[in-house]
């Protein structure tokens, strides 16, 4: 299919800043206009882009969900930056969802690591020092563990 | 993960009128920009319409502009694509897609998902 095929319409919308694209493609910020001539700024807030491009539509905005904190807030340019809160995590295995970190180390087990947004506490065996694999256990010691200082925090895109 | 199911697809006339609808289900896909692609048999997928997450911006194919609109409802999570002034030309396997954004052309961008496909006959 060729750029040609292409017939866009779009709706009245709020006053949008236009430039040219530089080699068809549009800054971060921006997307490529119904007829390719112009570059079209996304809308504060609502939608961004982040590199050179020559997208229909900029990137919806991310919101955070309940239990998540707003880090920073989505510009034309950057998504929204989401973290869990204090004494939640998020595991690269389920990123949709922030889990409760464990308030103790199993038996036999001592704390080494705490919670933080993007792990939970780590454990290791008094002997042998070998990590626990993460389960829950069964049965906790009150070895209790307190939320970590934030540090790096964990983008969700669009 | 997104699911996304065709229906609406059937044998019309030319000249008749046939609304596709695209049920998505898994995740909201208020996020994502959607489109309409279709593939006539012995011929590759081609961008049919898109608009985006907020369903204010619209692109067509030059070969469909004036005679399909797209439209999408966010609170039930479905795309809709009303097709009128059908032609033998349409006749095609129609398919919904979900994502990021599309480039200019139509590719999709970022994570996209793909319904299974409804078919559009178009024969006296």
């Known amino acids: 299919i060729t750029q040609q095929d292409l017939a866009p319409q779009q709706r009245a919308a709020p006053q949008q800043k236009r430039s040219s694209p530089s080699e068809g493609l549009c800054p971060p910020g921006h997307h490529i206009s119904e007829d390719g001539r112009d570059c079209i700024s996304c809308k504060y807030g609502q939608d961004y882009s982040t590199h050179w491009n020559d997208l229909l539509f900029c990137l919806r905005c991310t919101r955070c969900d309940s239990g998540e904190v707003e880090l920073s807030p989505c510009t034309t340019t950057r998504n929204t930056v989401c973290q869990c809160e204090e004494g939640t995590f998020r595991e690269e295995d389920s990123p949709e969802m922030c889990r409760k970190c464990r308030t103790g180390c199993p038996r036999g087990m001592v704390k080494v690591g705490d919670c933080t947004p993007w792990s939970d506490i780590e454990c290791v065996h008094k002997e042998s020092g070998t990590k626990h694999s993460g389960e829950v256990p069964a049965v906790e010691e009150t070895v209790t563990s307190s939320p970590g200082t934030p540090a790096s925090p964990c983008s969700l895109s669009g | 993960e997104v699911q996304l199911l065709e229906s609406g697809g059937g044998e019309v006339q030319p000249g008749g009128s046939l609304r596709l609808s695209c049920a998505a289900s898994?995740?909201?896909?208020?996020?994502?920009?959607m489109g309409w692609f279709r593939q006539a048999p012995g011929k590759d997928r081609e961008f049919v319409s898109a608009?985006?997450?907020?369903?204010?911006?619209?692109y067509y194919a030059e070969s469909v502009k004036g005679r399909f609109t797209i439209s999408r409802d966010n609170a039930k999570n479905t795309l809709y694509l009303q097709m009128s002034s059908l032609r033998a030309e349409d006749t095609a396997v129609y398919y919904c897609a979900a994502a990021q954004s599309f480039r200019r052309g139509g590719a999709p961008y970022g994570d996209n998902y793909w319904g299974q496909g409804t078919l559009v006959t178009v024969k006296p």
């Open positions: 898994g995740r909201t896909v208020s996020n994502y920009a």
């Open positions: 608009l985006n997450w907020g369903g204010d911006t619209t």
